[in-house]
């Protein structure tokens, strides 16, 4: 008995050949013996069954003595045996159909958890396979489960369905909700304007939700909402911002924040959500604000840094075109009685400058 | 073809009002954000009030806030200004302008309707 | 709100000269700027929108650039009938604001 394997929802064609290469009277049943479709001469006729409004034919083969059954629409429940009489002959086609589908929806946030849900026939026993766009597999029976998405998860899962030595292979369009980076981090001078951008990875046709900028800049105790906006069909409207610092927010994706400048009472961390309609959780977004400030007052020479600094981060004075005169790995440096010329202050990471702020030093009298 | 075209500019005393309408036609109304810019005589271009087209939010410029109500009737694909409390200053050439598509500038722009404001 | 500095205020030249029209945002705006050409008794007119796309129908001579705070218009060759007033507008969040106007004369 020959084994076809069809998908839910698509389209299905099962061959029937006769010896004779021209249009003969063929017909074609279930396993009930219930008539789906035959001929009449040069018309299609339809029997009781089921399938009634989803079957049909090629006219222009039979002619060839090629009598196909086409089944539209395809439903788990048309997984049966499928007789072609022709010419006192019979010939049985086993069609198994299958469907997989995303648990929830398949638009779903970073960290939560995707299932596929194999719906088979009964008496099947499939294996089901999927391959995600970042090349890991997973195997599995009626139900596949990947826990935690990654942003690398968006895109095409390709499933194959292995029954019976055959396969039929699903493509679903899985998109993980999410911020194009989890962190990032900004390094400015006192006094230069600051700008968040939050690019998000994904494109939808409508996006709506609420969300909010909370700020631990590391000189105050507590954090502090800075900014609440909505999203609406893509367009960013604030409902509150704080006085201080005066936030501007563009009113276009992507979300991009500015502050007038940057001062050391705003050096500190933030974390950015965003709540989606008719999603449960929130997207997230670190972002951090490094600032500097060189100053020289009377004899001494100073440059400072405020904000999340990692250990490793070096700090330095130098005099142009000079060897640094202090380099250390704290948040501080400074030099007495420095020479007239300008000098550098330096933030770097392993030899690359983050952030040189410079400062001229006029000669004493 | 998009077309714009304001009504009900004229004269009014200070503390007097005036509503003046923007008929549309031609593009999908329901969904453009619209605004209304005004120009004082041999003076330059101010943006005075806009209304977004994805959830009906309302904004003003400082100086017309408190005073002057932005509205639209969708089913009659009209746009409103309600100005109230008008002083001298207001006395002005009042556009009304379509955005673009996804809010990147004005691309259509009604003829203008004069507002004059003088006892 | 977000202050737009436009310069020069006024500008003379000939035709076939190439304009620049600068526009500075108080606050980076990205690239939410757009640029409007005004006539005398007429309503303006855009001529480019996200700081560098050319409207539709607009002549290619005209073209913009910059991001973040500073912005410019440039004429590559004047034509009599681009005589007039330009103005700069920030569309980055409301309320919306124009630059102060450049008036283009006829040297």
């Known amino acids: 008995k020959k084994v076809v394997l069809g998908k839910k929802g698509d389209t299905v064609e099962l061959t029937c050949t006769a010896s004779q290469k021209k249009s003969i009277q063929f017909h074609w049943k279930n396993s009930n013996q219930i008539k789906i479709l035959g001929n009449q001469g040069s018309f299609l006729t339809k029997g009781p069954s089921k399938l009634n409004d989803r079957a049909d034919s090629r006219r222009s083969l039979w002619d060839q003595g090629n009598f196909p059954l086409i089944i539209k629409n395809l439903k788990i429940e048309d997984s049966d045996t499928y007789i072609c009489e022709v010419e006192d002959q019979k010939e049985e086609v086993q069609l198994l159909v299958f469907g997989l589908t995303a648990n929830s929806d398949t638009h779903l946030l970073q960290g939560q958890s995707l299932t596929l849900t194999l719906e088979s026939p009964p008496g099947s026993s499939p294996s089901v396979q999927c391959r995600s766009p970042r090349g890991k597999n997973i195997q599995g029976g009626k139900t596949l489960s990947v826990s935690q998405l990654e942003l690398q998860d968006s895109g095409t899962w390709t499933c194959t369905v292995l029954q019976n030595q055959k396969k039929v292979e699903f493509k679903i369009d899985i998109v993980v909700l999410a911020f194009q980076k989890a962190s990032s981090i900004v390094y400015k001078k006192e006094g230069e304007q600051v700008e968040f951008s939050f690019p998000l990875a994904f494109t939808v046709e409508k996006l709506t939700g609420s969300g909010e900028l909370w700020w631990q800049a590391e000189r105050a105790s507590s954090s502090k909402s800075w900014i609440t906006f909505d999203l609406k069909n893509k367009e960013v409207s604030v409902k509150r911002v704080t006085q201080d610092p005066k936030l501007q927010m563009g009113k276009k994706l992507p979300l991009h924040l500015t502050l007038p400048q940057a001062l050391p009472q705003y050096a500190g961390s933030g974390n950015l959500t965003l709540a989606l309609e008719a999603k449960t959780g929130k997207l997230h977004q670190e972002v951090n604000l490094v600032v500097m400030r060189a100053t020289q007052l009377q004899k001494n020479l100073t440059c400072e840094v405020w904000g999340p600094t990692s250990p490793k981060l070096m700090l330095s004075l130098k005099l142009e075109n000079k060897e640094a005169k202090v380099s250390k790995r704290e948040k501080a440096v400074w030099v007495l009685n420095p020479e007239a010329g300008m000098w550098q202050c330096l933030l770097s990471d392993s030899g690359q400058v983050l952030l040189e702020s410079n400062i001229k030093v006029l000669p004493t009298w | 073809e998009v077309q714009l075209l304001e009504s009900g500019g004229g004269l009014v005393q200070p503390g007097g009002s005036l509503r003046l309408s923007c008929a549309a036609s031609g593009f999908t109304f329901s969904t453009n954000a619209m605004s209304w810019v005004r120009q004082a005589p041999g003076k330059g271009l101010e943006w005075v009030s806009g209304i977004s087209g994805s959830n009906g939010n309302t904004y003003y410029a400082d100086s017309v806030k408190g005073r002057f109500i932005i509205s639209r009737d969708i089913s009659k694909n009209t746009l409103y200004l309600e100005m109230n409390s008008l002083r001298a200053e207001d006395t002005a050439v009042y556009y009304c302008?379509?955005?673009?598509?996804?809010?990147?500038?004005?691309?259509?722009w009604g003829q203008g309707t004069l507002v004059t404001v003088s006892s | 709100a977000i202050q737009m500095t436009q310069s020069p205020s006024s500008l003379s030249a000939s035709v076939g000269d190439r304009v620049t029209i600068t526009c500075r945002a108080s606050?980076?705006?990205?690239?939410?700027l757009g640029w409007y050409q005004q006539k005398p008794g007429k309503a303006p007119k855009l001529l480019i929108y996200?700081?560098?796309s050319l409207q539709s129908g607009v002549p290619s001579r005209f073209s913009g650039s910059g991001s973040g705070t500073d912005f410019t218009l440039t004429i590559s060759s004047l034509q009599p009938e681009d005589f007039a007033t330009y103005y700069c507008l920030q569309d980055y969040n409301y309320p919306y604001t124009f630059g102060q106007g450049t008036k283009l004369e006829i040297k």
């Open positions: 606050h980076v705006i990205r690239n939410d």
């Open positions: 996200a700081a560098s």
């Open positions: 302008a379509k955005e673009r598509d996804n809010w990147n500038g004005f691309d259509y």
